[in-house]
Every structure is written in structure tokens, then in C-alpha cells.
């Protein structure tokens, strides 16, 4: 495919990435799928600057990001290393809380109303953010 040089309509550019901010809610898996269908992924926060940028755009609203531990360890959806990467958890989080009564623990990460992160039940219908890198090849066939 050809290399993407500018962001799609309704996406916001920041530091060579494009971001799309939902205004409705979906379960984490549905949000993840939505981003994949857009040739993107749920947002992967790699720095303090990116955290502040996303936080500015989403406001004080619970919003899914591309971080989960559904298979054991915490993983970013694009393969970015979790252990050495940026983290912004609320105090005492993540806690894999079972007391919500919805079955299981909490396996998906979201931005809370103050921007810090929390783990929550993946089925909750939160807003979400998609991200795609400008420098990666798009899946669209090249124009002949």
C-alpha cells in the first residue's frame, strides 16, 4: 500500500499520528474492532505529551485505550512494550476488581475523568479513541 501522508477527514493530527475521538460508547472489543476496520488501533499512549493531547480532546469522560490484560499480562494492542512504557494509573490501580458483580475482574484500561488510568469491565460502553501512524503504509491499493 501507499504511505499515508495526511490524516483522514475528521481525524486530528498530532506528532505524526492521526486520532479519531468517538462521541458514543461501545464495549472495549467493539471499539477495538471499529478502529481496526478504520485501518487503525485503539490509542496507544507512549509519552506524557501524548497523554496530555488525548486528555485535552476527550475531556473528563471515561474513554477506552488500547491496553488490556485479557490474556494475563498487560499488553498494548500495537505491541508496544508495557513494562518499559509510559503509565499513568490512578493510585491503587490496576486492581482487577471483582466486586462489581458483573462476573470476572477488570481487564481493559480507560482514561478516567481526570485523565489517569483505571482498569474496568471490558463490556462497559465507554467512548474510545482510534490512532493510526502517518508513516505507516495504508491498506488502500495504490492509484494506477
Amino acid at each position: 500500500g501507499s504511505e499515508r501522508t495526511c490524516c483522514p477527514v475528521n481525524w486530528v493530527e498530532h506528532e505524526r499520528s492521526c486520532y479519531w475521538f468517538s462521541r458514543s460508547g461501545k464495549a472495549w472489543a467493539d471499539a477495538d474492532n471499529y478502529c481496526r476496520l478504520e485501518d487503525a488501533h485503539l490509542v496507544v499512549v507512549t509519552s506524557w505529551e501524548e497523554q496530555k493531547f488525548v486528555q485535552h480532546h476527550i475531556g473528563p469522560v471515561n474513554t477506552w485505550m488500547g491496553l488490556h490484560d485479557q490474556n494475563g499480562p498487560w499488553k498494548w494492542v500495537d505491541g508496544t512494550d508495557y513494562e518499559t512504557g509510559f503509565k499513568n494509573w490512578r493510585p491503587e490501580q490496576p486492581d482487577d476488581w471483582y466486586g462489581h458483580g458483573l462476573g470476572g475482574g477488570e481487564d481493559c484500561a480507560h482514561f478516567t475523568d481526570d485523565g489517569r488510568w483505571n482498569d474496568d469491565v471490558c463490556q462497559r460502553p465507554y467512548r474510545w479513541v482510534c490512532e493510526t501512524e502517518l508513516d505507516k503504509a495504508s491498506q488502500e491499493p495504490p492509484l494506477l
Epitope: T46, S47, W48, E49, K52, P60, T84, G85, F86, K87, N88, D113, D114, G115, R116
Partner: antibody
Framework: QVQLVQSGAEVKKPGASVKVSCKAS????????FHWVRQAPGQGLEWMGW????????NYAQKFQGRVTMTRDTSISTAYMELSRLRSDDTAVYYC??????????WGQGTLVTVSS | DIQMTQSPSSVSASVGDRVTITCRAS??????LAWYQQKPGKAPNLLIY???SLQSGVPSRFSGSGSGTDFTLTISSLQPEDFATYYC?????????FGPGTKVDLK
């Protein structure tokens, strides 16, 4: 112009607490994170944590968790840093700093805290 | 935590000299690095942010470069007021960490 003015020097005994203030002017106080950094005599700079004046969220360096509390009073555009259970190695100049783009773009003048019995 | 190292730890130079200070991060920090100047008894003063952007009001003889793990601060022509200690700082992830400093003094 942006200004951060800190409270005066303090002398404390080991085990006591100290509360340093930092009054901001020249910009929207609630719009930017506030950081606290300290510097022991003749030593380098050490980040202690941040507070966001808009929502009171905090993030403390692990080294200081359980001993530091960062607060703010938006009505007077002032941030506070309280450090408890003081030890002699907490003797340092404590700075507040405004968050900038991948940096601390404005700093207070510093507050010397001396811990001595 | 991300460790920051600086070299040299001190440098003796004369007015008009070109001075280069390097900073290395123990892991990749993209370009999220700042440089500060500190004089005795004073607070640090921001010179460079985002590795290469000059802070407003800072003379153009100061410049920064690098990304990833290796960064450089250059003073193209040292002036009398530039004798000070210089610190790098990573602003990529918590806890934010500083280099140990480089003291620039008169030869």
C-alpha cells in the same frame, strides 16, 4: 508574564512536616500541571510529582509516596507541597514548576527546607 | 526508571568557544528531552524543549539535537553569562528524571 512565587525558608526538626506554597500569576492557573522538584545541597535535581489544579489529580514519584501531599487552592492560584516525617536527607531547596511542552517552562525561586535537630 | 547520563561532568572553556554536552537515556524517549541552565543560588532556566526547540527568550547560540536515546546541547560561542551547570531531563514517562549535570567553567 508568568511568575511563580514560593514561600520562605523553613527550619524543621526530624519527624516534623513542612508545607511549601507556590503562588502563580500571569497565566490560567487551572490550565496546566504543576510539578515539584527538589535539589539537595550541591546535588542534582529530583522530580517529586505533579498535581493538576483543574481536577486535583496527583501523581507522586514512588520514592515520596506516603510522605508527600500536593494540593491547591484555585481561589488564590496557589499550589502546595507538604512533606511529612522529615529526615535530615530531606534538607534541600524545593521548587515548583509549571508544566510545558516536554519540559518545565517556568520555575519558582525555590524554598530552602533545612531539617536539623 | 529511565536513567539519564551526561558527559562530560565538567568542561573548562573560554569565551567564544564552542561547547558540546551530550545526554543519554537508558531507554528510548523519542524527542521528549529538555535542557536547563542553572546558576548558583538560582532556579533552573529552560533552554531547549522537545530535544531541539528553543525556548522563547533564549539566545540562538544554544541549540539542541537528537532523538531516541542520544541528545546534544551545543553552545556555538560561549559568552560570559553562560558559565553555569547544565541539566538534561527526560519528560517521556514517570518518574521524570534529570541528568547529573555538566558544569561549564572558565579555563
Amino acid at each position: 508574564q508568568v511568575q511563580l512565587v514560593q514561600s520562605g525558608a523553613e527550619v524543621k526538626k526530624p519527624g516534623a512536616s513542612v508545607k511549601v506554597s507556590c503562588k502563580a500569576s500571569g497565566y490560567t492557573f487551572t490550565g496546566y500541571y504543576f510539578h515539584w522538584v527538589r535539589q539537595a545541597p550541591g546535588q542534582g535535581l529530583e522530580w517529586m510529582g505533579w498535581i493538576h489544579p483543574n481536577n486535583n489529580a496527583t501523581n507522586y514519584a514512588q520514592k515520596f509516596q506516603g510522605r508527600v501531599t500536593m494540593t491547591r487552592d484555585t481561589s488564590i492560584s496557589t499550589a502546595y507541597m507538604e512533606l511529612s516525617r522529615l529526615r535530615s536527607d530531606d534538607t534541600a531547596v524545593y521548587y515548583c514548576a509549571k508544566d510545558g511542552r516536554s519540559s518545565f517552562d517556568y520555575w519558582g525561586q525555590g524554598t530552602l527546607v533545612t531539617v536539623s535537630s | 526508571d529511565i536513567q539519564m547520563t551526561q558527559s562530560p561532568s565538567s568542561v573548562s572553556a573560554s569565551v567564544g568557544d564552542r561547547v558540546t554536552i551530550t545526554c543519554r537515556a537508558s531507554q528510548v524517549i523519542s524527542r521528549w528531552l529538555a535542557w536547563y541552565q542553572q546558576k548558583p543560588g538560582k532556579a533552573p532556566n529552560l533552554l531547549i524543549y522537545a530535544a531541539s526547540s528553543l525556548q522563547s527568550g533564549v539566545p540562538s547560540r544554544f541549540s539542541g539535537s537528537g532523538s531516541g536515546t542520544d541528545f546534544t546541547l551545543t553552545i556555538s560561542s560561549l559568552q560570559p553569562e553562560d558559565f553555569a551547570t547544565y541539566y538534561c531531563q527526560q519528560a517521556n514517562s514517570f518518574p521524570f528524571t534529570f541528568g547529573p549535570g555538566t558544569k561549564v567553567d572558565l579555563k
